[in-house]
């Protein structure tokens, strides 16, 4: 003998977050008379999704006109799907009863899986800057994706990195997942312009992976090299001494001239020149009045770079010899814009 069956033809339905899910249900008979209800989950804790008879279900619409007595199609649409909507949905036929309707037959269930895109990967580097030859760690995080399968790659200037560790959480079943990866990068002096890229590939992205980037300019500190040279005499009894500060990054730099250990002048690097690799050069001049000194003068160029302990370079200026014959004839790297440094 024929008896009403509730057919849910789709064992599973996969929907992208934000889209509408159609859950199909057909009753194979118009009798017994009674409403259909949709539930998520089974058992006592099941959640009512739609009740044909009563209630307000703003996100749910019926595919067919359920007011027609000859309707057999009890499919529903759920709008604006989120990962939280994932689960197994059951179409349940009730038989009209008094005082309450009685559950008569349930469909086999349709598992709704939600495809959710991962959030844009956020790459963060170390809190403090590090110098070349040091290894630094970068982290990459992306959240809210489903299903769990995901691929993460690290690149430095287009070259794939291999030294990284990745975790996808949680380990068990969940409505959505997060990925966390830590990569180790060895810094070089040429890394001011370098970029570290975290690339995330997921089924929802249709082959167009998401990328998060970190500029190594935020991470690296390239300490300067100093060179102090004595220039030809500019005027009688005056010697021009230059301190060339080369290949430093970032720009934050303070230079102090000391004459025999006493502070002569302090200045902050302003008009710098940039090298192709992104590091900076700067030059400071000190005009020393030789006639003011009876003894030899020890000139020190002391540089404090990016809050680090000062480094210095000294030059001994002999006052006994004739100024015109003194020192080296090394040409200064004079850009013209540094004239204000000449005292």
């Amino acid at each position: 003998e024929e008896e009403l069956q509730v057919i849910q033809p789709d064992k599973s339905v996969l929907v992208a977050a934000g889209e509408t899910a159609t859950l199909r249900c057909t009753a194979t008979s118009l009798i017994p008379v009674g409403p259909i209800q949709w539930f998520r989950g089974a058992g006592p804790g099941r959640e009512l999704i739609y009740n044909q008879k009563e209630g307000h279900f703003p996100r749910v619409t019926t595919v067919s006109d359920l007011t027609k007595r000859n309707n057999m199609d009890f499919s529903i649409r759920i709008g604006n799907i989120t990962p939280a909507d994932a689960g197994t949905y059951y179409c349940v036929k009730f038989r009209k009863g008094s005082p309450d309707d009685v559950e008569f037959k349930s469909g086999a269930g349709t598992e709704l899986s939600v495809r959710a895109k991962p959030s844009a990967p956020v790459v963060s580097g170390p809190a403090a800057r590090a110098t070349p030859q040091h290894t630094v760690s970068f982290t990459c995080e992306s959240h809210g994706f489903s299903p769990r399968d995901i691929t993460l790659k690290w690149f430095k200037n287009g070259n794939e990195l291999s030294d990284f560790q990745t975790n996808v959480d949680p380990v068990g079943e969940s409505v959505s997942y997060s990925i966390h990866s830590t990569a180790k990068v060895v810094l070089t002096r040429e890394d001011v312009h370098s970029q570290v890229i975290c690339e995330v590939a997921h089924v929802t992205l249709q082959g167009d992976p998401l990328r998060g980037t970190a500029n190594l300019s935020e991470t690296i500190r390239v300490p300067p090299t100093l060179e102090v040279t004595q220039q030809p005499v500019r005027a009688e009894n005056q010697v021009n001494v230059t301190c060339q500060v080369r290949k430093f990054y970032p720009q934050r730099l303070q230079l102090t001239w000391l004459e025999n250990g006493n502070v002569s002048r302090t200045e902050t690097a302003s008009t710098v020149t940039e090298n192709k690799d992104g590091t900076y050069n700067w030059m400071s001049w000190l005009l020393v009045n030789v006639s003011a000194h009876r003894d030899d003068v020890k000139l020190t160029c002391q540089v404090e770079h990016d809050g680090q302990p000062a480094v210095s370079k000294s030059h001994d200026l002999k006052v006994s010899a004739h100024p015109k014959e003194q020192g080296s004839n090394t040409a200064a790297e004079n850009t013209g814009s540094n004239e204000r440094n000449i005292y």
């Epitope: 003998e1 009403l4 159609t22 194979t28 009798i31 000859n70 057999m72």
Partner: antibody, heavy 122, light 107 residues
């Protein structure tokens, strides 16, 4: 006026395929469930398949399940029946039909086409 | 599937006669039953829906009754244009099924 016109019938060898079309006019095609019903020569009527007004639900008779596919193009007001792996017993006049009940599958067929003959023979 | 047994399979009656056709369902189908008329070489035409409701435009000499398993279709006064085969169809259960048909002829 309301009209359904079938086409695509013909003689075909067993195991081959055929695609029937049903052009609808005179009513809001996209609001109604649509059916295919067939009638073997000198025999009675047999329901074949139904498709919901929006294509979301499709049901088939056991005799054609897995071989026939019902579909529709609401932008063209056209119903289709793709018939694969045809057998001699599929020889029949194929009618498309609909009911006057909007937004349901509707099984009281008040509008019928004139039918198209499909002959499956080697 | 629900079996629909129609009887007689054919009948011959005179113009003006009352003609009765019966349709029996293999189990209770409530009143979800339709009656169709099919003239030779033509598509079927819906006459009665939900066992007893006359389709718009159908002459009142056609009527239907019954519920559960037993249904009756009646032509109160047979007319020459009524020569056709008549089918019952249930749609309580899927798939919808038709009776074998009753061929009505004029004596």
């Amino acid at each position: 006026q309301v009209q359904l016109v079938e086409s695509g019938g013909g003689v075909v060898q067993p195991g081959r395929s055929l695609r029937l079309s049903c052009a609808a006019s005179g009513f809001t095609f996209s609001s109604y469930g649509m059916h295919w019903v067939r009638q073997a020569p000198g025999k009675g009527l047999e329901w074949v398949a139904v498709i919901a007004y929006d294509g979301s639900n499709k049901l088939y008779a056991d005799s054609v399940k897995g071989r026939f596919t019902i579909s529709r193009d609401n932008s063209k007001n056209t119903l289709y029946l793709q018939m694969d792996s045809l057998r001699a017993e599929d020889t029949a006049v194929y009618y498309c039909a609909t009911s006057d009940t909007k937004y349901t599958l509707g099984f009281a067929f008040d509008i019928w086409g004139q039918g198209t003959m499909v002959t499956v023979s080697s | 599937d629900i079996q629909m047994t129609q009887s007689p399979s054919s009948l011959s009656a005179s113009v003006g006669d009352r003609v009765t056709i019966t349709c029996q369902a293999s189990q209770d189908i409530s009143n979800y039953l339709n009656w169709y008329q099919q003239k030779p070489g033509k598509a079927p035409k819906l006459l009665i829906y939900d066992a007893s409701n006359l389709e718009t435009g159908v002459p009142s000499r056609f009527s239907g009754s019954g519920s559960g398993t037993d249904f009756t279709f009646t032509i109160s006064s047979l007319q020459p244009e009524d020569i056709a085969t008549y089918y019952c169809q249930q749609f309580t259960y899927l798939p919808p099924t038709f009776g074998g048909g009753t061929k009505v002829e004029i004596k």
